[in-house]
Interface confidence: medium
């Protein structure tokens, strides 16, 4: 999942301290656009004819990285992050996951981090990471991450865990937004209307996206999440959620207003781009998937054929959070007034925009997005954010 | 520069249709997802309806849905709105906005829609 | 009657500061980082002054501050002058639709 935005509004001349954060696009209110859903929920929205489009009601986790040093360094842009409601609730993940052997049929190699572009986006697959069939972009958006679609589970209720990052990051701006043709195809006229134009579908490579120059990203682990609420009346889009990438970068023209990196430097420093999942068919209950996609430096092995998660903070299991010598804090935990406590206790507000601060045992702590209705918040703290509208 | 001019407003019967235009210049059209506001007279600003960049997703209100149609001809830099069935509160200047982030850094002047008998 | 709420008027003396507050729901201030102002001169359309609550657009003066608290955001506009005066409108993402909330506009007087 994309750690930092694309394209934001216009050049931000003082940094807000809570970027915003990914949520997914709405559906498409043609009168074609999506099946009726089965009530009427407050997040949906009414397509012409009546019909009720339902917004994707899951929730998208994305990695926060968070080794002590790494924390550290960002603690002095948390302070003035503006909770949202749900921040920085601890908890603990009631699944397991699988090692990376046993979920990828790809080989497992660290990607290197594309270069910060003032328009900057994440890296794109290559054309055998079963990405989504995106169609052709905008020459002007930098397609770097978000697309790589490992399969054909339904991102929008996957989750993603970014590997802490050992070494120097380059800084991200974190106010872009990338805009998609989230339901693109839907009536039947969209490039990817196709049933077969979801990830991981056959016959859609003519709507790959130009991934010329782009280094792929690699996605590790699966966790599959068991608890990810559905709503059967929630209408997952049969056609690419890539469709169309609306890159919100300012061109030649008025590149004076876009947002670079510059800007939100104490904040982005410290985030690492990722993959990003791609969407799953239209039917039937998604399997959310969780991906572990490493920064540019690998961290060694993944633990074994499971890995263990950090129980609730509070609970019991927190001894956990000291290391052997009884000096350092493990992953996902930062010494506060000489003890180890939780990231997700100590910063209520870790996630962004509702997000949800999990700990995972050896990898640290990590946000779940929410994602639903209009606007899909992403990024390892629910800092990014996509829109189609 | 970026600039956005729409046109095509006018006064036109209950029941009448409209076709509205905005034409831009000065940035990438089909990179950019575009809206129209109206704002009627004395009154604040409404979203109306919005499109994404390669037209594929349209949004509407609940007031226009039905009766206006969003569209745009990335070739010719335009985008559209095709009002029908006008009505008496449709009456405002309508702007069109390119969107950037979740607002919308450039307007057009407006064109104004006045429907009365 | 508008999605989100703002006081019809307010008025400031020059070089004073004022605030203009914009209500909501959880449902869109409140829930996201996602408020956005606008400066409309009469017959002018409107010109984005804030997004994101509280970032400024190059060329847009720092005098001109956002922030927000709760269902509440709030739109400061300190040393005011008198070009200030002006019509004010909020905006916000709204996760119900629509999409986009507009307040229904403040009048700033400067006295």
């Known amino acids: 999942v994309p750690a930092r935005e694309a394209g934001s509004a216009v050049e931000a001349e003082e940094l807000v301290k809570g970027s915003p954060a990914w949520e997914p696009p709405a559906n498409d209110t043609r009168e074609e656009a999506g099946p009726p859903a089965a009530g009427e929920d407050e997040a949906s929205w009414t397509a012409p004819g009546g019909e009720l489009a339902g917004p994707e009601e899951v929730l998208q986790e994305s990695a926060a990285v968070t080794g002590t040093a790494w924390l550290e360094a960002d603690s002095p842009g948390l302070g003035g992050v503006t909770a949202e409601a749900g921040s920085g609730d601890a908890q603990a993940l009631p699944a397991t996951l699988q090692a990376p052997h046993e979920v990828l049929g790809q080989s497992i190699m660290p990607p290197a981090i594309p270069e910060a572009t003032e328009a900057s986006g994440p890296p794109s697959p290559t054309p055998g990471d079963k990405l989504s069939p995106a169609s052709e972009l905008p020459k002007e958006s930098p397609l770097e991450v978000w697309l790589n679609l490992g399969g054909s589970t339904p991102d929008p209720q996957g989750p993603e865990l970014t590997y802490p990052f050992q070494g120097t990051l380059e800084p991200q701006p974190a106010s872009d937004i990338i805009d998609i043709d989230y339901f693109e195809g839907l009536d039947g006229e969209g490039r990817g209307a196709d049933l077969g134009s979801f990830p991981g579908s056959p016959g859609t490579s003519e709507n790959h996206p130009d991934t010329e120059g782009e280094t792929p990203s690699w996605s590790l682990l699966d966790l599959y999440d068991d608890f990810t609420p559905f709503d059967e009346s929630d209408f997952y889009p049969t056609t690419s959620f890539y469709d169309d990438l609306d890159e919100e970068e300012e061109e030649e023209e008025d590149d004076k207003d876009a947002v670079g990196g510059g800007d939100l430097e104490d904040e982005n420093e410290l985030l690492v781009p990722t993959g990003k999942p791609g969407l799953g068919p239209g039917t039937g209950q998604p399997t959310s998937r969780w991906h572990a996609v490493p920064p540019q430096h690998t961290l060694g092995s993944v633990p074994g054929s499971s890995i263990a998660l950090r129980p609730r903070p509070g609970e019991p299991g927190r001894d956990l959070a000291s290391s052997e010598n009884g000096t350092e804090c493990r992953s996902g935990f930062v010494r506060h007034n000489g003890s180890c406590r939780s990231v997700c206790d100590l910063f209520p507000s870790y996630c962004h925009n509702g997000g949800q601060c999990y700990l995972v045992e050896n990898i640290g702590a990590f946000c779940r997005c929410n994602t639903q209705d209009y606007i899909w918040h992403k990024g390892m703290r629910c800092e990014s954010i996509i829109t189609d509208f | 520069e970026v600039q956005l001019l729409e046109s095509g407003g006018g006064l036109v019967q209950p029941g009448g249709s409209l076709r509205l235009s905005c034409a831009a210049s000065g940035f990438t059209f089909s990179s950019y997802a575009m809206s129209w506001v109206r704002q009627a007279p004395g009154k604040g600003l409404e979203w109306v309806s919005a499109?994404?960049?390669?037209?594929?997703?349209?949004y509407y209100a609940d007031s226009v849905k039905g009766r206006f149609t969003i569209s745009r001809d990335n070739s010719k830099n335009t985008l559209y709105l095709q009002m029908n069935s006008l009505r008496a509160e449709d009456t405002a200047v309508y702007y069109c906005a390119k969107k950037r982030s979740l607002a919308f850094d450039y307007w057009g002047q407006g064109t104004l829609v006045t429907v009365s008998s | 009657q508008s999605a989100l709420t703002q006081p019809a008027s307010v008025s400031g003396s020059p070089g004073q500061s004022i605030t203009i507050s914009c209500t909501g729901t959880?449902?869109?201030?409140?829930?996201?980082?996602?408020v956005s102002w606008y400066q409309q001169y009469a017959g002018k359309a409107p010109k984005l002054i804030i997004f994101d609550v509280s970032k400024r657009p190059s060329g847009v003066s720092n005098r001109f501050s956002g922030s927000k608290s709760g269902d509440t955001a709030s739109l400061t506009i300190s040393g005011l002058q008198a070009e200030d005066e002006a019509d004010y409108h909020c905006s916000s993402y709204n996760r119900k639709r629509p999409p986009v909330l507009f307040g229904g506009g403040t009048k700033l007087t400067v006295l």
């Open positions: 499109i994404s960049g390669s037209g594929g997703s349209t």
């Open positions: 959880s449902t869109d201030v409140n829930g996201y980082n996602y």
